[in-house]
């Protein structure tokens, strides 16, 4: 898709980063084998991918976590892919839910989310989880990205 | 994306194959409803997808497996998507981990991996698992592919 | 990929819908934050995505379900992505299997399927599950889509 200057490739793939913040929004970094095609997609504040051009994007996230049923709330572990468009409320695009494992001390599970969505200029996407402390940040386990169709 | 001769579509989707080899690298075949767009991507030695052109690729793998917690080591089942570029060491692109099931004799689980990565000419990608004997090779359960953006 | 009139973008993302039908084929709707790029892909009878143009498509589905091992059959929960081409038998493209959870009243799990396939004009893809009553229809949990390369 060498699309020429008028229609360049737009793609990103960022890597999870452990954070001391208590927010449920996962943190990401341009590290390891990351992708950031050009400045038409940017990682802002380490938490959201923001696009400059309107269009259809395939957006994906993968989250690996380790949890135990007895040590967790009864609610499952939920990962949510969310959208914030300029002048609009946040909205959920995709969610996945996995009940906590009975394995001790914790059982690892991986979630994958992905779908095609229309994004407006300045739109941002980010990933929320129920308990960030359970997320695995080992090489390749948790990542987030998009590509413009 | 009929891209013309200068910029043809490049895509592959290959199907898992049971193997007598004791290696942790999964084996694949061009069988069933497979995809191999042209010779700009090839399946080499039944184990790796190799690309001829540099660029951004969305690479994915799905692995279904059946395992039992009592019969397994404490380590989870891990599937890894790995990259070997010419003149470089192998590196992990993506991993997923699932703790073994308590179901007897084994419990089935499916893992999906996918992300956007820059590949160099001659780069190969392959899939590693902790125990190939646990992998499910029934129709559609385990597959591997890529597409060039 | 502003491809021009000759080669327009073709993409869809549809949202799960609870159904009173006893069929194992999941039902979908153009609701919420859905995508339907143009009339070259259509949602037919609320159950299948049908394409008008031949080519390579990345097709995906995500299914979240809640089940319990004691209350379910011994067979795992299986989600299948299926293809019906004109004048051909249905065939399975992708499947994922997850053994039922021991959590009570039920344990949630999410499945993601995705792959690159050649579709003929008039081909339809749909999603089958072993027990539709176990599927979660909350915002973002279960969705289905495709994009033409």
């Amino acid at each position: 898709m060498q699309k020429g200057d008028q229609n360049p490739q737009i793609a990103a793939h960022v890597i999870s980063e452990a954070s001391s913040k208590t927010t449920s929004v996962l943190q990401w970094a341009e590290k390891g084998y990351y992708t950031m095609s050009n400045n038409l997609v940017t990682l802002e504040n380490g938490k959201q991918l923001t696009v400059k051009r309107q269009g259809l994007y395939y957006i994906y996230a993968q989250v690996t976590f380790c949890s135990n049923r007895e040590a967790s709330s009864q609610a499952p572990f939920i990962a949510s892919l969310c959208l914030k468009s300029p002048g609009r409320f946040e909205r959920i695009l995709l969610r996945a839910a996995n009940t906590h494992s009975s394995a001790k001390p914790c059982g690892q599970q991986s979630i994958h989310l992905g779908g095609v969505f229309e994004l407006q200029p300045g739109a941002s996407v980010f990933v929320n989880v129920t308990d960030p402390s359970q997320v695995s940040h080992g090489t390749g386990f948790t990542s987030f990205g998009l590509l413009k169709l | 994306m009929q891209k013309g001769d200068q910029n043809p579509q490049i895509a592959a989707h290959v199907i898992s194959e049971a193997s007598s080899k004791t290696t942790s690298v999964l084996q694949w075949a061009e069988k069933g409803y497979y995809t191999m767009s042209n010779n700009l991507v090839t399946l080499e030695n039944g184990k790796q997808l190799t690309v001829k052109r540099q660029g951004l690729y969305y690479i994915y793998a799905q692995v279904t497996f059946c395992s039992n917690r009592e019969a397994s080591s404490q380590a989870p089942f891990i599937a890894s998507l790995c990259l070997k570029s010419p003149g470089r060491f192998e590196r992990i692109l993506l991993r997923a981990a699932n703790t073994h099931s308590s179901a007897k004799p084994c419990g089935q689980q499916s893992i999906h991996l996918g992300g956007v990565f820059e590949l160099q000419p001659g780069a190969s990608v392959f899939v590693n698992v902790t125990d190939p004997s646990q992998v499910s090779h029934g129709t559609g359960f385990t597959s591997f592919g890529l597409l060039k953006l | 990929m502003q491809k021009g009139d000759q080669n327009p973008q073709i993409a869809a993302h549809v949202i799960s819908e609870a159904s009173s039908k006893t069929t194992s084929v999941l039902q979908w709707a153009e609701k919420g934050y859905y995508t339907m790029s143009n009339n070259l892909v259509t949602l037919e009878n609320g159950k299948q995505l049908t394409v008008k143009r031949q080519g390579l498509y990345y097709i995906y589905a995500q299914v979240t379900f809640c089940s319990n091992r004691e209350a379910s059959s011994q067979a795992p929960f299986i989600a299948s992505l299926c293809l019906k081409s004109p004048g051909r038998f249905e065939r399975i493209l992708l499947r994922a299997a997850n053994t039922h959870s021991s959590a009570k009243p039920c344990g949630q799990q999410s499945i993601h399927l995705g792959g690159v396939f050649e579709l003929q004009p008039g081909a339809s893809v749909f999603v089958n599950v072993t027990d539709p009553s176990q599927v979660s229809h909350g915002t973002g949990f279960t969705s289905f889509g495709l994009l033409k390369l």
Epitope: - | A71, P105, C106, S133, Q134 | -
Partner: nanobody, 118 residues
Amino acid sequence: EVQLVESGGGLVQPGGSLRLSCAASGRIFSTYFMGWFRQAPGKEREFVAASYTGGSGGSTVYADSVKGRFTISADNSKNTAYLQMNSLKPEDTAVYYCAAWLNGGNRWGQGTLVTVSS
């Protein structure tokens, strides 16, 4: 095509013993487990025991109801599994099915009847 064939079933008195065998034939590339299920009249098929090879070689797993009475073993070179059943009870009466995860798929035998009765 891989096939599983059971043998060794029959009539036995309570407290008695039987040994079941299951032989796998065909082109076998990999095995995760070989084991046994059983189905009593009017009941669902239930897990009995399994012997694991692959990366879990040497492990065995049993249903609670047969622990201490039944022993599963396997001869991996012959792709054969054995179930030694001791201290049999009338409630062990069932059709016993060999099951195996071979070449990445679940396979079943045709079953052999075990009757425990005085």
